[in-house]
Each structure stands twice: as structure tokens, then as C-alpha cells.
């Protein structure tokens, strides 16, 4: 039975040209996290594998940085980065947990800084 829950940064906003940390946290389970995939819509951004380390998709390598922890840092943000991001936790023995984050990249300098994990 899957008892865990994923906490995410939820809906966040950031300024164009800036950086943001995407962060998820799996709680309420003793399951072992074997891998975390980060995806934007259906596009793979990165994988963090417990045994093998990080894999950053080559097309994002110049502006995606691993971490902190199992999170992902997006740099040099553009308006095209606006959209849904998913953290997909593969765990044993529970199975798969998925968290959702919505990022809005704003043109102006009045981006709301409400996100707990945001880089100033």
C-alpha cells in the first residue's frame, strides 16, 4: 500500500533571466527512493539515480543544474519555461509517486517571491 505523499513548491513565479529551484519532498513512507525523474510536460530534464548519480538531458545541460538534494535548479529562465514540471519518484517497494509544480516566468521585475525554495 502506498502511504507516502509528495510535497512540492506548488505554483511559483520567477523573473525572466533569473533562476529557480524546483523541489519535491516525499514524506510519510519508509520506502527507498531509487530514482527521481524531472520532466517538463513530456520532456525529460534530468534524472537523479541513487546508484548512478545525475543524468542531465544534453539539450538542457547549459541551463539546468543538479540539486540541491534531489531538486533541480533552472537557470537563465525564459518565458518559454512557463508551464508544468513533474517530479517522479521511483521507490521500493511502494512504486511511483508524482508531484506537480507550475512555474510562471514573468517579464517584469515584479515576480512574486512566495516560493519557499526560490533563489533570490
Amino acid at each position: 500500500m502506498m502511504t507516502g505523499t509528495i510535497e512540492t513548491t506548488g505554483n511559483i513565479s520567477a523573473e525572466k533571466g533569473g533562476s529557480i529551484i524546483l523541489q519535491c519532498h516525499l514524506s510519510s513512507t519508509t520506502a527507498q527512493v531509487t530514482q527521481v525523474n524531472w520532466e517538463q510536460q513530456d520532456q525529460l530534464l534530468a534524472i537523479c539515480n541513487a546508484d548512478l548519480g545525475w543524468h542531465i538531458s544534453p539539450s538542457f545541460k547549459d541551463r539546468v543544474a543538479p540539486g540541491p538534494g534531489l531538486g533541480l535548479t533552472l537557470q537563465s529562465l525564459t518565458v518559454n519555461d512557463t508551464g508544468e514540471y513533474f517530479c517522479i519518484y521511483h521507490t521500493y517497494p511502494d512504486g511511483t509517486y508524482t508531484g506537480r509544480i507550475f512555474l510562471e516566468v514573468l517579464e517584469s521585475s515584479v515576480a512574486e517571491h512566495g516560493a519557499r525554495f526560490q533563489i533570490p
Epitope: 530514482q35 534524472i47 548512478l52 548519480g53 543524468h55 538531458s57 544534453p58 545541460k61 521511483h90
Partner: antibody
Framework: EVQLVQSGAEVKKPGASVKVSCKAS????????MHWVRQAPGQGLEWMGR????????KYNEKFKTRVTMTVDTSTSTVYMELSSLRSEDTAVYYC????????????WGQGTLVTVSS | DIQMTQSPSSLSASVGDRVTITCRAS??????LAWYQQKPGKSPKLLIY???TLAEGVPSRFSGSGSGTDFTLTISSLQPEDFATYYC?????????FGGGTKVEIK
């Protein structure tokens, strides 16, 4: 065109070390991790480890951890795999292989380097 | 460590035949499975990754299916250049294990 060109065959004595090179071309070298896989004569494939040409961070198969070292020379887009304390069971073809865009599989392979360990 | 078991270890077939090779993982590996083709004296060549995604330049007669623990590589109509050894690989856990291989020979 992506190309991985490996160094030539080697004959080594038990207890010695061997260093195999793999020169990459046709793509942005630092964007893709490189792996090493070996194949003993008439046998299957065995993963040895991976190295990030960008950060030079590496991950090794536990089986080889004490004997293998992977290094990078970004100025020549070359990766190296050194295996020490060679024994006869290390006789194999050693391949470098580029990590795929969507995970830890191998989308391009070098031509292979035969390492023979014999007294 | 997860073990990958291929079957059969060898098979004989004729040009035009439909060929199926299976690969079984010792535990759930989701869809993290790749297939490679290797001809004698040559390097392996990637055919399929993520269980069903065809690699660039691979003919459409090759297809992959399955998830969890049971996977299949199918060649819909065997061509002369397809006689080779095929390997499956779990591509998301150390030590990135391969199956033992399936040799496809001419009948």
C-alpha cells in the same frame, strides 16, 4: 557524425595496468557522460563505470571500484580508462560508449580495444 | 542487484520470419530497458531504449514492448542483416546489467 575512436590492442602481464583511450568527435563532448563496458571472449557485456567529461565526476561498478580509474582530457575530447592489478580474467574487449540523451543507456560505441592478459 | 534473463539463448530462423526475443527482470524495472544488436567482431548497436522507443536510424521492423518485469523485442520480418546477437539491458540501476544475449542464426 558522432565517432568514438579507441586506442589499439594491448598485451599485458598479470599484475600490470592498462590504460585505454577513447577520442570523441561529432558532438559537444562535455554534454554527454561516457561509459566503459567490457566483453570477455565469447561472453556477454559488463558495465564498468561512467564519467562526466564536464565535472569529471565518476561512478563505478562495485566489482571494479578498487581497480578502475576513469579520467578525461577535455582539450582533446578524450576519456581514459585505467585498470590495474590485471589478471587473466580481465582479458576482454573494452568499449567506450556514450550515454544516451534520455537515460543511462548507450547510443554510440567505440570500436573496442582488445586487452590480453597473459604471462 | 537486478538480474536480466533472456530467452531463448539462441534461435534459428529464415529470412522473412517474425522473431520474438524475451527479457525478464528479477524485479520491477518500469520501462527502463534497452535492446542492442551485436554482429561478430563489431561493437553493439542501440536499437531501442525505454522499452519501446526506436533509436535513430533503426528500421521500423524492430519493435519493443513490455514494462515491469517482462519485455519483448520483435523483428517483424527478418532480413539477412539481422542475423546477430541481441542483448537487453536495464538502464536505470547499477551495475546497469545486461541479459546473457540471444543469438539469431540462419535456419
Amino acid at each position: 557524425e558522432v565517432q568514438l575512436v579507441q586506442s589499439g590492442a594491448e598485451v599485458k602481464k598479470p599484475g600490470a595496468s592498462v590504460k585505454v583511450s577513447c577520442k570523441a568527435s561529432g558532438y559537444t563532448f562535455t554534454n554527454y557522460w561516457m561509459h566503459w563496458v567490457r566483453q570477455a571472449p565469447g561472453q556477454g557485456l559488463e558495465w564498468m563505470g561512467r564519467i562526466d567529461p564536464d565535472s569529471t565526476g565518476s561512478k563505478y561498478n562495485e566489482k571494479f571500484k578498487t581497480r578502475v580509474t576513469m579520467t578525461v582530457d577535455t582539450s582533446t575530447s578524450t576519456v581514459y580508462m585505467e585498470l590495474s592489478s590485471l589478471r587473466s580474467e580481465d582479458t576482454a574487449v573494452y568499449y567506450c560508449a556514450r550515454e544516451g540523451a534520455y537515460g543511462y543507456y548507450f547510443d554510440y560505441w567505440g570500436q573496442g580495444t582488445l586487452v590480453t592478459v597473459s604471462s | 542487484d537486478i538480474q536480466m534473463t533472456q530467452s531463448p539463448s539462441s534461435l534459428s530462423a529464415s529470412v522473412g520470419d517474425r522473431v520474438t526475443i524475451t527479457c525478464r527482470a528479477s524485479e520491477n524495472i518500469y520501462s527502463y530497458l534497452a535492446w542492442y544488436q551485436q554482429k561478430p567482431g563489431k561493437s553493439p548497436k542501440l536499437l531501442i531504449y525505454n522499452a519501446r522507443t526506436l533509436a535513430e536510424g533503426v528500421p521500423s521492423r524492430f519493435s519493443g514492448s513490455g514494462s515491469g518485469t517482462d519485455f519483448t523485442l520483435t523483428i517483424s520480418s527478418l532480413q539477412p542483416e539481422d542475423f546477430a546477437t541481441y542483448y537487453c539491458q536495464y538502464h536505470s540501476g547499477s551495475p546497469l546489467p545486461f541479459g546473457g544475449g540471444t543469438k539469431v542464426e540462419i535456419k
